[in-house]
Amino acid sequence: DADMKGHFDPAKCRYALGMQDRTIPDSDISASSSWSDSTAARHSRLESSDGDGAWCPAGSVFPKEEEYLQVDLQRLHLVALVGTQGRHAGGLGKEFSRSYRLRYSRDGRRWMGWKDRWGQEVISGNEDPEGVVLKDLGPPMVARLVRFYPRADRVMSVCLRVELYGCLWRDGLLSYTAPVGQTMYLSEAVYLNDSTYDGHTVGGLQYGGLGQLADGVVGLDDFRKSQELRVWPGYDYVGWSNHSFSSGYVEMEFEFDRLRAFQAMQVHCNNMHTLGARLPGGVECRFRRGPAMAWEGEPMRHNLGGNLGDPRARAVSVPLGGRVARFLQCRFLFAGPWLLFSEISFISDVVNNSSPALGGTFPPAPWWPPGPPPTNFSSLELEPRGQQPVAKAEGSPTA
């Protein structure tokens, strides 16, 4: 959508993040163990022949799958693609990993297992030591730390070289909190849940994570259809029924990495009013600098005008007036039976001299009233170091 200013294009967020070209230093590569110093973590760079040609763990990865290679990107990145190889060893290496799992963290404390859109965790790896196998991560992960867990179906040696591809997560969004998305019953069920949310879900509330509202995928005009192949109706949208909210609004909370001056929030909404989806009638946001602090000043209120009869999906821009905060709470007012969002992003600037939140920790409990919320897209640094992105070819091994 041309009207999504600052919205990143996930198809272009595919730059090598620095294993192969060594912009990721050795000190940011570690492992649970190494077979020897010559197969230490620092030898895990894609296409490198350093040492004995790869990282190889000391222990067996069968049956426990506890050995891992860790890459610390130092800042939050959207990781859209990974590449793996086996051990080089001057062409004599025989060790590679046929499959692996990924875990990732934004704060170094809470680790999430990556899953594809159908809940599958195991990623197909290499069939030989030298070939590079690229895996498109759908959904991508917002991470600072990534761990590769090689797998085997029997006791055997496995070794690994890796690269990560993506771009800097400039938005700074650490998590959003929202009520659980609901099912709309038409002639078929339309599942408007946040199916890639990586935080916690309890008591009708999702908190401490990111999901489809921050994945860069903008929904279609017909919310029953999707950009993705082989997914269920409603996949691109998260939605709530007005009948579920006595308050008349859905409330969301957003946590950022550091103090930011917020210029605007952009919410990509469906407006297929013939099936009950309507743009919000208005948005009200409030701001605070810390999780235990009071909300500051008056809320920013924005009533939505425009061509509400036009059934096309669109980005709604909510001005935030340069307000400084690390936490935002926004209420989206119902103007019809359903609110359906596919993305939420923020245009903001880091406030100079603000230090990052401690890993972006999550509060012990929600501290806001009820309702559903917004989410975010990210404005990303798209072209680090003048590289070209890794292309995505339909039907290629990266699909």
Epitope: A189, Y191, G203, H243, P366, P369, P370
Partner: antibody, heavy 121, light 107 residues
Framework: QVQLVESGGRVVQPGRSLRLSCTAS????????MLWVRQAPGKGLEWIGT???????YYASWAKGRFTISRDNSKNTLYLQMNSLRAEDTAVYYC???????????????WGQGTLVTVSS | DIQMTQSPSSVSASVGDRVTITCQAS??????LAWYQQKPGKAPKLLIS???DLASGVPSRFSGSGSGTDFTLTISSLQPEDFATYYC?????????FGGGTKVEIK
């Protein structure tokens, strides 16, 4: 194990006040919408009120002003303060936890055993 | 305030019968409806949320349908353990009234 235990029910005279408690174990109360529901002898279920995870409260129209729901997160306990009690408030009082099913809609999946309040002179 | 009206207030049936209980809301509530079963001296038990969604462990002979203002709970083949009182509830994030209940008795 995950459970809710109500306490504080007793015989009380009309016009007096009473506070009921509901102590949660196995989960944090402040992550959930929590409800108080009552049932008079031989009658149906009657919703009294709800407190959200953000401490917003909702009440049945007949309960507004006389009944107050609160929560002490440090004790993981939910309260129902009842004032100016009347004979028709005689009932078993339940606390319950709202959870979402697979389709995202709420239902009361966890209930306490109930505590009996008898209002009589 | 939304009111929930259940009918019938009681029904006599035999094991194996198909039993239908209806619940009507005073205004549209979309799909925001739950059903409960309660036996004497016990707390209610959740059967269905969101009109259709069976709670964990609930037998498939129970099913829900409807939308807007009119809803139905159906027990396809009544079992001895199903004799109880059934309640519908409008349960949004907020005000949550119950229906008056339907007692399913042995004929």
């Amino acid at each position: 194990q995950v459970q809710l235990v109500e306490s504080g029910g007793r015989v009380v005279q009309p016009g007096r006040s009473l506070r009921l408690s509901c102590t949660a174990s196995g989960f944090s109360l402040n992550r959930y919408y929590m409800l108080w529901v009552r049932q008079a002898p031989g009658k149906g279920l009657e919703w009294i009120g709800t407190i959200s995870y953000g401490d917003t409260t909702y009440y049945a129209s007949w309960a507004k002003g006389r009944f107050t729901i609160s929560r002490d997160n440090s004790k993981n306990t939910l309260y129902l303060q009842m004032n100016s009690l009347r004979a028709e408030d005689t009932a078993v009082y339940y606390c319950a936890r709202a959870d979402t099913g697979d389709n995202g809609y709420l239902g009361l999946q966890l209930w306490g055993q109930g505590t009996l309040v008898t209002v009589s002179s | 305030d939304i009111q929930m009206t259940q009918s019938p207030s009681s029904v006599s049936a035999s094991v194996g019968d198909r039993v239908t209980i209806t619940c009507q809301a005073s205004q549209s509530i979309g799909s925001v409806l739950a059903w409960y079963q309660q036996k004497p001296g016990k707390a209610p038990k959740l059967l269905i949320s969101g009109v259709f969604d069976l709670a964990s462990g609930v037998p498939s002979r129970f099913s829900g349908s409807g939308s807007g203002t009119d809803f139905t709970l159906t027990i396809s083949s009544l079992q001895p353990e199903d004799f109880a009182t059934y309640y519908c509830q409008y349960i949004p994030y907020g005000s949550s009234p119950f229906g008056g209940g339907t007692k399913v008795e042995i004929k």
